[in-house]
Interface confidence: low
């Protein structure tokens, strides 16, 4: 399923994007899954749909639940699910794990902390930043656009960083906060030619016609923060988005950092309702960084149903 977890705090704005993409010209309908009730598009409502975005202005704990978005084009529909949880504000300073966005790590050279989800909102500078609930002060801290830069990073700079900003909707202002952990790496990172862990080169993957199939492209690029590293799938040498087959989609997996400190990425290719013609395609897992590009090719073959004898 194309499902995405989203969370927010009561009385703050929360904006959720449909996990299925489509052209701006496509219409997107939103429903509350439990009741199948359509979400209104009129902006006077506290919860309303605006194209690919679902807006809670402000959010309430009772808004928690699963929301369905359907991207409609002239030739196909794509369905996604947004699993929304709204939490009560904490009275103490601690931010619970379930409210934390992904951890970022920095080093002396690279100490940017991006404010999570901010791109979804209509906000204006400046951003306010807090560390462990204390407002950040001093010349070492610079709020720049949607991120915080810390000069001369030290190990003591590790901790939970919260960004706070104001979302403006038709003249009304709503507060938004988002928190993520920042860790400091002592050792110097390095970058190397991409190493694809999966799939194996020229792998044959068995699939069943009519069933769903997933292919994972996983690669490692070095240690520490990587500048410009990517994994992606291509079909017959064409980007997935350009291939034009809505049954076949790619979805970013988790950024991984293994115990040995290697920075790895993966991209999952999801094929819905496998068809005969899918067996004729060439599936390329590409891993790319500044050193170059590595490609592993996969082909699909039909899995023969096993005869079950009693």
């Amino acid at each position: 399923k194309f499902s995405k977890q989203s969370w927010g705090l009561e009385n703050e704005a929360l904006i959720v994007r449909c996990p299925r993409q489509g052209k701006p010209s496509y219409t997107v309908d939103w429903y509350y899954s439990q009741t199948n009730k359509s979400i209104p598009t009129q902006e006077r409502n506290r919860v309303f749909a605006s194209g690919q975005l679902l807006k809670f202005l402000p959010a309430a704990v009772a808004d928690s639940g699963i929301y369905t978005c359907i991207v409609r084009s002239p030739t196909f529909n794509r369905t996604g699910y947004a699993n929304v949880t709204i939490y009560k504000k904490q009275s103490d300073c601690n931010v619970p794990d379930y409210l934390m966005y992904s951890t970022v790590s920095g080093s002396e050279k690279n100490s940017k902390i991006y404010c999570p989800t901010i791109d979804l909102y209509n906000w204006t500078a400046p951003l306010e930043w807090f560390k462990n609930c204390q407002a950040l002060q001093g010349s070492r801290y610079r709020a720049h656009k949607s991120f915080l830069v810390i000069d001369n990073v030290m190990t003591e700079d590790a901790g939970d960083y919260t960004c706070k900003f104001i979302h403006n909707e038709n003249g009304a202002n709503y507060s938004v906060t988002a928190t993520r952990s920042f860790t400091v790496k002592d050792e110097q990172g390095f970058s190397l030619f991409p190493v694809i862990g999966a799939p194996a080169q020229n792998e044959i993957k068995e699939v069943e016609i009519g069933k769903n199939a997933n292919l994972t492209c996983s690669a490692c690029f070095g240690k520490g923060t990587q500048f410009l590293a990517a994994v992606l799938w291509q079909l017959n040498g064409t980007k997935i988005t350009d291939f034009g087959e809505p049954r076949i989609q790619q979805e970013e997996g988790q950024n991984q950092s293994f115990s040995n400190g290697l920075a790895c990425l993966d991209m999952v290719l999801r094929i819905a309702d496998v068809k005969e013609e899918d067996l004729l395609l060439q599936y390329d897992c590409l891993a790319l960084n500044l050193h170059g590009l590595r490609r592993h090719t996969v082909r699909l073959s039909r899995k023969n149903p096993i005869d079950h004898h009693s």
Partner: antibody
Framework: QVQLVQSGAEVKKPGSSVKVSCKAS????????VSWVRQAPGQGLEWMGR????????NYAQKFQGRVTITADESTSTAYMELSSLRSEDTAVYYC?????????????????WGQGTLVTVSS | EIVMTQSPATLSVSPGERATLSCRAS???????LAWYQQKPGQAPRLLIY???TRATGIPARFSGSGSGTEFTLTISSLQSEDFAVYYC?????????FGQGTKLEIK
């Protein structure tokens, strides 16, 4: 450090074709897109198209579609731009440029490296 | 195609002063795909800023970029004599990549 070295100036008759080369050294030629950008005398920059050698992918600006062909030879790290049916308004300096970077979102097509330019004069 | 419009066409500023150049896109462009170039007569363009605000290697700190959506700005904080040139913005958000028509920065 990537260096792009282009072929020399050309004088061509209207209706003919010109093929300009761009040899790369000092970088991973295959991975980076090579774009062609032209500049008519006293005018601004105009993107014509690009090739991503390792993916054998080309894209062209609509204006030049059908008249321009961009190719690449990975073995010599050389890109080529051929423009046919030349007319006087094609008189310009033609640059090759690279440095754009591909990731899962698409192309960050900024050009860090430029050739020295090739003047193509179309005159009868 | 996305049309990039630069203003002003010509900007006259004295050395040591601040120069602000504008670039407007005909439709929204993700800031990751916006670059600025400097070009001097008889030379190839030179990349100054990419990703709307990141300085390219070797570019002095007096050059800075900002903006998002359809409005982008290149600022030169204290003009040096070598900064007088033509400046172009460029988007690579969608094909065809397009450049602005250029802003000529001249000595006042």
């Amino acid at each position: 450090q990537v260096q792009l070295v282009q072929s020399g100036a050309e004088v061509k008759k209207p209706g003919s074709s010109v093929k300009v080369s761009c040899k790369a050294s000092g970088g991973t030629f295959s991975t980076f897109g090579v774009s062609w950008v032209r500049q008519a005398p006293g005018q601004g920059l105009e993107w014509m198209g690009r090739i991503i050698p390792i993916l054998a992918t080309t894209n062209y600006a609509q204006k030049f579609q059908g008249r321009v062909t961009i190719t690449a030879d990975e073995s010599t790290s050389t890109a080529y731009m051929e423009l046919s049916s030349l007319r006087s308004e094609d008189t310009a300096v033609y640059y090759c440029a690279s440095g754009d970077y591909y990731d899962s979102s698409g192309y960050y097509g900024y050009f860090q490296h430029w050739g020295q330019g090739t003047l193509v004069t179309v005159s009868s | 195609e996305i049309v990039m419009t630069q203003s002003p066409a010509t900007l006259s500023v004295s050395p040591g002063e601040r120069a602000t150049l504008s670039c407007r896109a005909s439709q929204s462009v993700s800031s990751s795909y916006l670059a600025w170039y400097q070009q001097k007569p008889g030379q190839a363009p030179r990349l100054l800023i990419y990703g709307a605000s990141t300085r390219a290697t070797g570019i002095p700190a007096r050059f800075s970029g900002s903006g998002s959506g359809t409005e982008f700005t290149l600022t030169i904080s204290s003009l040096q004599s070598e900064d007088f040139a033509v400046y172009y913005c460029q988007q690579s958000y969608s094909i065809p990549f397009t450049f602005g028509q250029g802003t000529k920065l001249e000595i006042k």
